[in-house]
């Protein structure tokens, strides 16, 4: 066997005393939890599709990539990954598809290197506002998170608590301003009807934002102005009817942006004129030649780029499903 001249679990144990969730015994450098596969050279632990009901306590200290997908964790308590010595190298944590319905405050505390977190495909009925910030202070210590993947975390209708799901998620994103360094945020497939107006302004480092496959009807009250680093904005498969001048100007003003707008029910009436003019001139919309009208009926499947002002008139009556905006 190889001879470690400094054991992989020899991280400093001078960290402050951790809560009771801390596992008492420091793991051996080559220890691998039951029902998991480990590679120290790849710094990876995979505990995949094993129906685990809790996070293993004996995770090796070398772990940088931890896959806990396809399990039955249900609840992620405070300090779920706190260990002594801490998992100081853990950089990527994938908890997707593990039937989590509750993530408590401080669930990801004591992970100083955590850069990527994937909670996708969990029915998160109860996401603590302090899940990512770890404390209820108005300004928390900055989170090291760079990528936060929250696709398809909406619970079934009957499991939702009596509050806005959008509001619950946004509260967790904004608590304590901990996620100021976040560069990628994925919120696809969450039935979002709206985007709270303050959320993007408080995530100034975003490079990639995925809001695809939601139910967004309008971006009128959403400001992209502060997102000067934004490189990709995915808005495919929503319920967008038109983008108005303010939004168009803000998007055009972002220096690196690529916008994806496919499969939205664009309403090609007189309110669409500015967007059509903009589309013909802009380079920021990817696949803009694929965008087609959904309403009114006489305009269905017409390509937006091929429209001119004479095509865009306003009839007094809109389909009932579109009168709620």
């Amino acid at each position: 066997s190889s001879s470690p001249t400094s054991s992989a679990s020899s991280f400093s144990s001078s960290a402050p005393f951790l809560a009771s969730a801390v596992s008492a015994q420091p793991p051996l450098p080559d220890q691998c939890p039951a029902l998991c596969e480990c590679s120290e050279a790849a710094r990876t632990v995979k505990c995949v599709n094993r129906n685990l009901t809790e996070v293993p306590t004996d995770l090796p200290a070398y772990v940088r990539n931890l896959f806990l997908t396809g399990n039955q964790l249900a609840v992620l308590p405070a300090g779920a990954f706190a260990r002594r010595p801490p998992l100081a190298e853990l950089a990527a944590l994938n908890l997707s598809g593990s039937r989590l319905d509750e993530v408590r405050a401080g669930a990801f505390e004591h992970l100083p290197s955590l850069r990527q977190l994937d909670l996708s495909h969990n029915p998160l009925a109860d996401l603590s506002p302090f899940a990512f910030s770890g404390s209820n202070a108005s300004v928390s210590a900055p989170s090291p998170l760079v990528e936060l993947i929250l696709n398809h975390i909406v619970p079934p209708e009957d499991e939702r608590q009596n509050r806005s799901f959008e509001g619950m998620v946004v509260a967790a994103l904004l608590a304590g301003r901990a996620l100021q360094g976040l560069r990628r945020l994925e919120l696809a497939s969450n039935h979002f009807l709206y985007l709270p107006r303050d959320v993007l302004a408080q995530l100034p480092s975003l490079r990639h934002l995925d809001l695809s496959n939601n139910s967004l009807v309008s971006l009128t009250y959403v400001s992209f102005r502060n997102l000067t680093h934004l490189e990709s904005l995915h808005l495919e498969d929503n319920a967008l009817k038109v983008l108005h001048n303010g939004t168009l100007a803000e998007l055009q003003g972002l220096p690196h942006i690529r916008v994806f707008l496919d499969n939205n029910p664009w309403v090609c009436d007189c309110h669409m004129a500015d967007m059509v003019t903009w589309l013909k001139e802009t380079e920021v919309v990817q696949g803009k030649d694929r965008l087609t009208c959904a309403y009114p009926e006489k305009m269905r499947n017409r390509v937006l780029l091929e429209l001119n002002s004479a095509d865009l008139d306003c009839d007094p009556i809109l389909p009932p499903s579109l009168q709620t905006s």
Epitope: S10, F11, S39, E40, A42, S113, E147
Partner: antibody, heavy 125, light 107 residues
Framework: QVQLVESGGGVVQPGRSLRLSCAVS????????MNWVRQAPGKGLEWVTF????????YNADSVKGRFTISRDNSKNTLYLQMNSLRAEDTAVYYC??????????????????WGQGTTVTVSS | DIQMTQSPSSLSASVGDRVTITCRAS??????LAWYQQKPEKAPKSLIY???SLQSGVPSRFSGSGSGTDFTLTISSLQPEDFATYYC?????????FGGGTKVEIK
């Protein structure tokens, strides 16, 4: 571009010492784990030793245990291999190789993704 | 230590041939396996990681498969630049170990 350049090889008598260096450019050396791998004439590859990005973790093959020491100077962008008590069977081309994992990387582990051109060590009386 | 055994140790093939190289681990290593290509007097080059994932920039004619103890590297249509020696390497645990190599020569 990313480059690893080994130096310090040569002919040395059994029992003597040699220090190899690997000068790094084109990436943030202090973020990457590193390895030394060797290849005896006409033979296959043999992993020798590993060091983590900050020098806190080191691993050696049993064949060099107690004789070879890997180290690094992140301020100089240089990886070292101190070889003591050299034997004829240590004769080989020595490659430094970057581990695909860096301190800031959180994707798959790609193995040893960048290699130097190698430096030849000949142990002979 | 985990021993890696490659076969064949050498083979002769023609341009356009399909070439298969096997690698067997002395104990299960899940998918913690990489493949490298080495040409004479050159440093090795990484081809495949995690048993089947193609390294960026590597032509798609190269593919890897296997899990546990038995692994395969396949070159679907051998090209002139593919004549080289190929090594498997396990990274399930330290010490990292390589197979003995398979030399692919021109028939």
């Amino acid at each position: 571009q990313v480059q690893l350049v080994e130096s310090g090889g040569g002919v040395v008598q059994p029992g003597r010492s040699l220090r190899l260096s690997c000068a790094v450019s084109g990436f943030t050396f202090s973020s990457y784990d590193m390895n030394w791998v060797r290849q005896a004439p006409g033979k296959g590859l043999e992993w020798v030793t590993f060091i983590s990005y900050d020098g806190s973790n080191k691993y050696n093959a049993d064949s060099v245990k107690g004789r070879f020491t890997i180290s690094r100077d992140n301020s100089k962008n240089t990886l070292y291999l101190q070889m003591n008590s050299l034997r004829a069977e240590d004769t080989a081309v020595y490659y430094c190789a970057r581990d695909s994992y860096s301190r800031s990387w959180y994707g798959d582990y790609y193995g040893m993704d960048v290699w130097g051109q190698g430096t030849t060590v000949t142990v002979s009386s | 230590d985990i021993q890696m055994t490659q076969s064949p140790s050498s083979l002769s093939a023609s341009v356009g041939d399909r070439v298969t190289i096997t690698c067997r681990a002395s104990q299960g290593i899940s998918s913690w396996l990489a493949w490298y290509q080495q040409k004479p007097e050159k440093a090795p080059k990484s081809l495949i990681y995690a048993a089947s994932s193609l390294q960026s920039g590597v032509p798609s004619r190269f593919s890897g498969s296997g899990s546990g103890t038995d692994f395969t590297l396949t070159i679907s249509s051998l090209q002139p630049e593919d004549f080289a020696t190929y090594y498997c390497q396990q990274y399930n645990s330290y010490p990292l170990t390589f197979g003995g190599g398979t030399k692919v020569e021109i028939k």
